[in-house]
Amino acid sequence: KSKSDRIVNETLYENTKLLSATGESEKQFQEAIIVFQEEFKCCGLVNGAADWGNNFQHYPELCACLDKQRPCQSYNGKQVYKETCISFIKDFLAKN
């Protein structure tokens, strides 16, 4: 369990940099995370909205807080979900 946990952690941390990338090859991963964010009302992988780098400037709706019952915070003048997606992803992988 702890070994698979470590592998998942390392993989997610490594892939965090893909969110701030602007190339076509990273688009598929970004789109998958966007869908995940919308479903689980979370933002980014490790550092929240900051994980998206300059992409956040162009698409601040990426993490937009649409549910006032969930913890939200201001980031670059926008209300975004406070919780990162890493724990949700780990739970999701564990269940599936």
Epitope: E31, E39, H58, Y59, L66, K78, Q79
Partner: antibody, heavy 116, light 109 residues
Framework: EVQLLESGGGLVQPGGSLRLSCAAS????????MSWVRQAPGKGLEWVSA????????YYADSVKGRFTISRDNSKNTLYLQMNSLRAEDTAVYYC?????????WGQGTLVTVSS | QSVLTQPPSASGTPGQRVTISCSGS????????VYWYQQLPGTAPKLLIY???QRPSGVPDRFSGSKSGTSASLAISGLRSEDEADYYC???????????FGGGTKLTV
């Protein structure tokens, strides 16, 4: 090319029900949130409802909450709006739109008339 | 009564610059992106500006958006007759937990 085609509109009596459909093509439907926006004759735009890509989250305007239900079938690339307990003030052209932040593509709309 | 306030009408002559305002509050414009939509007579709305000031591909650079505090504005320069339409601002209101539109501005050229 992104295409959204609404259907199911028509004339219905107050208190009646109607189900609108929106057939989507030209994009990966299951990757996008979807919305319904309406426009009463000669009036402005009013957001009605939105649904997340996997249907986990739904959102409704206060004016339709408890009466309308948004749903989707990702295997059929189709968005739905079940409208119950219809009122005269629900008379409008109903547009299906991709996403909700922002609505980046719109269908041509279907007219719903609620009248006795 | 719309949550976002827009002037009901605006006008200009060909070649002129016109600005349409959109006023809101901290629960909508102040903390979220603003979007602008153009609705030509008898047609469905079309996205004109997203994320306060970004233009989707295909939208001429004559259209520009800006935001300051709880207000936003849409500027159209080099006005053309085909710009005659209704313009709506919109954003998410996290107090209402819903998307809100301005009442719309009818632009006459």
């Amino acid at each position: 090319e992104v295409q959204l085609l609404e259907s199911g509109g028509g004339l219905v009596q107050p208190g009646g029900s109607l189900r609108l459909s929106c057939a989507a093509s030209g994009f990966t439907f299951s990757s996008y949130s979807m919305s319904w926006v309406r426009q009463a004759p000669g009036k402005g735009l009013e957001w009605v409802s939105a649904i997340s890509p996997g249907s986990s989250n739904t959102y409704y305007a206060d004016s339709v909450k408890g009466r309308f239900t948004i749903s989707r079938d990702n295997s059929k690339n189709t968005l739905y709006l079940q409208m119950n307990s219809l009122r005269a003030e629900d008379t409008a052209v109903y547009y299906c739109a991709r996403k909700h932040m922002p609505f980046d593509y719109w269908g041509q709309g279907t007219l719903v008339t609620v009248s006795s | 009564q719309s949550v976002l306030t827009q002037p009901p009408s605006a006008s200009g002559t060909p070649g002129q610059r016109v600005t349409i305002s959109c006023s809101g509050s901290s629960s909508n414009i102040g903390n979220n992106s603003v979007y602008w939509y153009q609705q030509l007579p008898g047609t469905a709305p079309k996205l004109l500006i997203y994320s306060d000031s970004q233009r989707p591909s295909g939208v001429p650079d004559r259209f520009s958006g800006s935001k300051s505090g709880t207000s936003a504005s849409l500027a159209i320069s080099g006005l053309r007759s085909e710009d005659e339409a209704d313009y709506y601002c919109g954003t998410w209101d996290y107090s209402l937990n819903g998307y809100v539109f301005g009442g719309g501005t009818k632009l006459t050229v």
